[in-house]
Interface confidence: low
């Protein structure tokens, strides 16, 4: 008996060949012998079973003495033996659809589980094997779960199901819904204008939900909502901004937030979550906000930085064109009775400066200008 | 501690400008937003914008952005706000304000002593 | 705009007893478990004066016979024992959303 693999929702063609190259007398019936179709000189005739409207041949055929059933929109319960009865001999073949499913939707948030479900007929005993598009393999029975979505999970997952040594092959295309990036970090100098940007990692026709940044500065006890906005089919609407610091929010995508200016009581760190229509759990990017701030006072030249910084991050200060005065692992350094000249204030991390702000200071009768 | 001293009165006639000042003290000035609110004589009070003096960002009320521009001097911690075409619609004692810390920062809680603006021909 | 709609417009309250200050907002102005309406007292010829904000929390170096209360749209002012200095206009303030609205205010005479 010949074993065809079928796919759910697909079409699949069922051949029978007769030995004379003619258009000769033939039939397809289901295994309670019930007649799907067959043909009555030229014309196709059709039986009582729920075949009916999705069973058809290729009469194109007829005449080189082939006499397919073609059957559309497989369903599960199409899963049967089918005998094509010609020229007094009876072609058996067994048909097993299968059906392969994401749990609940293909577009999944970031750290949910994804599970594919296989629909099989009675009786089979498949195996399924999946391959992920970042090329992670996984095998199961009826069910395969992969926990933790990681944003490289999206894409086309191709799964093939074996069974009887046949194989078909599906494949899923799954979106994972997250941002760009899991973290970003800002550096500032004091004053200046900070942007935000929370790209995402997909694209959908219509986007709606809601988003809030909270935001934990590191001078503050406790995280505060900074502002809360819509978003519907891509346009972003403000609902809710604090008055210190006022945001400001850009209406398309991608989120866009800027900061007015940077200050020392903002530094710190944020979460902006974002939860989509009819999804359960919220797109989470976090953002950090590194605010230096290089001053004067009387004898004393200070560097400070405030805000989420490394402990491998170094803090110097330096005369424009000369060696590092002071360098420090530290979030402020310092130079008593600093000499006149621009001074250049670093945060580096292995060499590379992430950050400066420069301070000029005058002779001793004058006072400090920043630039 | 935390002091706003405002310009002293203005008499102004029809149609010119006037520009008044907000001087800080006791708290670094590009710290805090700077508010504006007006209060015409028996009525109530109403915000007109607020300025970030260490950017110089400026936000207005809708109803009143045309009437105002806010700006402000980091050096000598001083916000300002001029008003033009004038009438008399905008004789009224005219108020900086600076919001609180932690738990009042969404309220005004220092305020400047006022300017009183009079338009008169 | 958020309208702040104060009753009553003025109010006479004998000495030591309590005058009570309403104001309803057009909206709530409630948000994550915050109510964000604050009050202000303003005698003759001074700035106002902040008195309450967060609906609830006495600011610094006011006295505790002020109190407030209410949340979503309908908010309270209470001054218990009324005192001789408390006489004044009262304003309540929205600051949960741009601009921020003051309401028309209450005229409290001391009886």
């Known amino acids: 008996k010949k074993v065809v693999l079928g796919k759910k929702g697909d079409t699949v063609e069922l051949t029978c060949t007769a030995s004379q190259k003619k258009s000769i007398q033939f039939h397809w019936k289901n295994s309670n012998q019930i007649k799907i179709l067959g043909n009555q000189g030229s014309f196709l005739t059709k039986g009582p079973s729920k075949l009916n409207d999705r069973a058809d041949s290729r009469r194109s055929l007829w005449d080189q003495g082939n006499f397919p059933l073609i059957i559309k929109n497989l369903k599960i319960e199409d899963s049967d033996t089918y005998i094509c009865e010609v020229e007094d001999q009876k072609e058996e073949v067994q048909l097993l659809v299968f059906g392969l499913t994401a749990n609940s939707d293909t577009h999944l948030l970031q750290g949910q589980s994804l599970t594919l479900t296989l629909e099989s007929p009675p009786g089979s005993s498949p195996s399924v094997q999946c391959r992920s598009p970042r090329g992670k393999n996984i095998q199961g029975g009826k069910t395969l779960s992969v926990s933790q979505l990681e944003l490289q999970d999206s894409g086309t997952w191709t799964c093939t199901v074996l069974q009887n040594q046949k194989k078909v092959e599906f494949k899923i295309d799954i979106v994972v819904l997250a941002f760009q990036k899991a973290s970003s970090i800002v550096y500032k100098k004091e004053g200046e204008q900070v942007e935000f940007s929370f790209p995402l990692a997909f694209t959908v026709e219509k986007l709606t939900g809601s988003g809030e940044l909270w935001w934990q500065a590191e001078r503050a006890s406790s995280s505060k909502s900074w502002i809360t906005f819509d978003l519907k089919n891509k346009e972003v609407s403000v609902k809710r901004v604090t008055q210190d610091p006022k945001l400001q929010m850009g209406k398309k995508l991608p989120l866009h937030l800027t900061l007015p200016q940077a200050l020392p009581q903002y530094a710190g760190s944020g979460n902006l979550t974002l939860a989509l229509e009819a999804k359960t759990g919220k797109l989470h990017q976090e953002v950090n906000l590194v605010v230096m701030r290089a001053t004067q006072l009387q004898k004393n030249l200070t560097c400070e930085v405030w805000g989420p910084t490394s402990p491998k991050l170094m803090l110097s200060l330096k005369l424009e064109n000369k060696e590092a005065k002071v360098s420090k692992r530290e979030k402020a350094v310092w130079v008593l009775n600093p000499e006149a000249g621009m001074w250049q204030c670093l945060l580096s991390d292995s060499g590379q400066v992430l950050l400066e702000s420069n301070i000029k200071v005058l002779p001793t009768w004058s006072t400090p200008v920043q630039p | 501690q935390v002091q706003l001293q405002q310009s002293g009165p203005e008499l102004v006639k029809p149609g010119a400008s006037v520009k008044m000042s907000c001087k800080a003290s006791?708290?670094?000035?590009?710290?805090?937003?700077i508010n504006w609110v007006k209060q015409r004589t028996g009525q109530g009070l109403e915000w007109i914008g607020e300025?970030?003096?260490?950017?110089?960002?400026?936000y207005y009320n809708e109803n009143l952005k045309d009437k105002a521009t806010l700006t402000a001097d980091k050096s000598s911690n001083t916000a300002y706000m001029q008003l033009s075409s004038l009438t008399s619609e905008d004789s009224a004692v005219y108020f900086c304000?600076?919001?609180?810390?932690?738990?009042?920062?969404?309220?005004?809680?220092?305020w400047g002593q006022g300017t009183l603006v009079t338009v008169s021909a | 705009d958020i309208v702040l709609t104060q009753s009553p417009a003025s109010l006479a309250v004998s000495l030591g007893q309590r005058a009570t200050i309403s104001c309803k907002a057009s909206?709530?102005?409630?948000?994550?478990?915050?109510?964000?309406m604050n009050w202000y007292q303003q005698k003759s010829g001074q700035p106002p004066k902040l008195l309450i904000y967060?609906?609830?929390n006495l600011e610094s170096g006011i006295p505790a016979r002020f109190s407030g209360s209410g949340s979503g749209t309908d908010f309270t002012l209470n001054i218990h024992p009324v005192e001789e200095e408390d006489a004044a206009t009262y304003y309540c303030?929205?600051?949960?959303?741009?601009?921020?609205?003051f309401g028309g205010g209450t005229e409290l005479e001391i009886k």
């Open positions: 909206q709530s102005v409630d948000y994550d478990g915050d109510s964000y």
């Open positions: 300025i970030y003096p260490g950017s110089g960002s400026d």
């Open positions: 304000a600076r919001k609180g810390e932690n738990g009042n920062s969404l309220a005004f809680a220092y």
């Open positions: 006791g708290y670094t000035f590009t710290d805090y937003v």
């Open positions: 303030q929205q600051s949960i959303q741009d601009p921020c609205t």
């Open positions: 967060a609906a609830s």
